[in-house]
Interface confidence: medium
């Protein structure tokens, strides 16, 4: 009974206090004295994707019935343990994390598939899965050995806005260059033709070899 009351109170405290220094030892050593221990398995190592997403399975060996299960992800770096995210779910239903949580997850029987998003190299660390069978009694607590998540930041890319400006500048430059080239070629060609020639629409051959590759102008002679 004391165990149950204590643990429920503790579970509520966990929400309020999101960072506890040196409390992992307390979890591992002190709690099992008061409550029934439960085995929790999770992979030893996971490499986050280039987009900063890491997924792993947290499996617990339920020794009794559970209608309401609470899953908490803790991050241990040095001697500091921080709560990353937590969700309580009804057995057979989906996990629901807070809207602003970096975690998502699905449940299937005694397995919880957890996904942590938005990870960066500085988030590399040991991510511990903590499972609590909240209801019905008896209360069970299980803490995994942790999953070492390695996060490698991708090679820094130029700022997308900067790339856009470069692209715009190059495009503009090419446009003005081609415009200028056309204008110069036209003016040279107009200077060389006779202004009083009469005739019909005639496709003119290039007057100068160097202009050959640039255009094939149409000359419209007028009476």
């Amino acid at each position: 009974m004391a165990c149950l009351g204590f643990q429920r109170h503790k579970a509520q405290l966990n929400l309020a206090t999101r960072t506890w220094p040196c409390t992992l030892l307390f979890f591992l050593l002190f709690i099992p004295v008061f409550c029934k221990a439960m085995h929790v398995a999770q992979p030893a190592v996971v490499l986050a994707s280039s987009r900063g997403i890491a997924s792993f399975v947290c499996e617990y060996a339920s020794p009794g019935k559970a209608t309401e299960v609470r899953v908490t992800v803790l991050r241990q770096a040095d001697s500091q343990v921080t709560e990353v995210c937590a969700a309580t779910y009804m057995m057979g239903n989906e996990l629901t994390f807070l809207d602003d949580s970096i975690c998502t997850g699905t449940s299937s029987g005694n397995q919880v598939n957890l996904t942590i998003q938005g990870l960066r190299a500085m988030d590399t660390g040991l991510y511990i899965c903590k499972v609590e069978l909240m209801y019905p009694p008896p209360y069970y607590l299980g803490i995994g050995n942790g999953t070492q998540i390695y996060v490698i930041d991708p090679e820094p890319c130029p700022d997308s806005d900067f790339l856009l400006w470069i692209l715009a500048a190059v495009s503009s430059g090419l446009f003005f260059y081609s415009f200028l080239l056309t204008a110069v070629s036209l003016s040279k060609m107009l200077k060389k033709r006779s202004p009083l020639t009469t005739g019909v629409y005639v496709k003119m051959p290039p007057t100068e070899p160097e202009c050959e590759k640039q255009f094939q102008p149409y000359f419209i002679p007028i009476n």
Epitope: M1, L4, S62, K65, P137
Partner: antibody
Framework: QVQLVESGGGVVQPGRSLRLSCAAS????????MHWVRQAPGKGLEWVSV????????YYADSVKGRFTISRDSSKNTLYLQMNSLRAEDTAVYYC???????????????WGQGTTVTVSS | EIVMTQSPATLSLSPGERATLSCRAS???????LSWYQQKPGQAPRLLIY???TRATGIPARFSGSGSGTDFTLTISSLQPEDFAVYYC?????????FGQGTKLEIK
């Protein structure tokens, strides 16, 4: 010996209220979750509601949600079911049953009362 | 909700015969959340089996339960006259908790 005794049933008009009681004896009432289960005439069993050993968790069947309220008074070793806005389809024998033992969490509804009849009719 | 479907609806057998009652869940139910109950006319239900296969206190050895996932079975190895009753399976894996519609075991 371990015993559950329901009371409070009777004939009531639709829309009215009724409160059922279940007196527990022979065991530590505060160590067990408690259920209400009903059985309409000639029909099967239908789970109605459950309350945890300490009263902190309460769950209901969709058919009674918002109308029925389960509660308990450990000082009196008594379980209650407050039934409001009663309908004809609530007519049934109502049983209280003891839930899983808090030490193992593995038993089913192992102790049942004899039931109390609720008839909703105009 | 999880729908529990029992079959057959009625089973007619003679004393001494073996009875096999089936219970199928519409979704997977972990075996520890499955119970069987016996109910005789005018009486309250009685717990026979919990955790799919464990006999409740005072239940004779002729009653046995088995199954996992979605299919569960209650077997009565040799029927006694007092075994003729209605049998219900029940899950408390997922809320709302649900019972099967019952199998009536009658004397042939």
């Amino acid at each position: 010996q371990v015993q559950l005794v329901e009371s409070g049933g009777g004939v009531v008009q639709p829309g009215r209220s009724l409160r059922l009681s279940c007196a527990a004896s022979g065991f530590t009432f505060s160590n067990y979750g408690m259920h209400w289960v009903r059985q309409a005439p000639g029909k099967g069993l239908e789970w109605v509601s459950v309350i945890s050993y300490d009263g902190s968790h309460k769950y209901y069947a969709d058919s009674v949600k918002g109308r029925f309220t389960i509660s308990r008074d450990s000082s009196k070793n008594t379980l209650y079911l407050q039934m409001n806005s009663l309908r004809a389809e609530d007519t049934a024998v109502y049983y209280c049953a003891r839930d899983d033992d808090i030490l193992t969490g593995l038993y089913g509804m192992d102790v049942w009362g004899q039931g109390t009849t609720v008839t909703v009719s105009s | 909700e999880i729908v529990m479907t029992q079959s057959p609806a009625t089973l007619s057998l003679s004393p001494g015969e073996r009875a096999t009652l089936s219970c199928r869940a519409s979704q997977t139910v972990s075996s520890i959340y499955l119970s069987w109950y016996q109910q005789k006319p005018g009486q309250a239900p009685r717990l026979l089996i919990y955790g799919s296969s464990t006999r409740a206190t005072g239940i004779p050895a002729r009653f046995s339960g088995s199954g996992s996932g979605t299919d569960f079975t209650l077997t009565i190895s040799s029927l006694q006259p007092e075994d003729f009753a209605v049998y219900y399976c029940q899950q408390d894996y997922k809320l709302p908790y649900t019972f099967g519609q019952g199998t009536k075991l009658e004397i042939k």
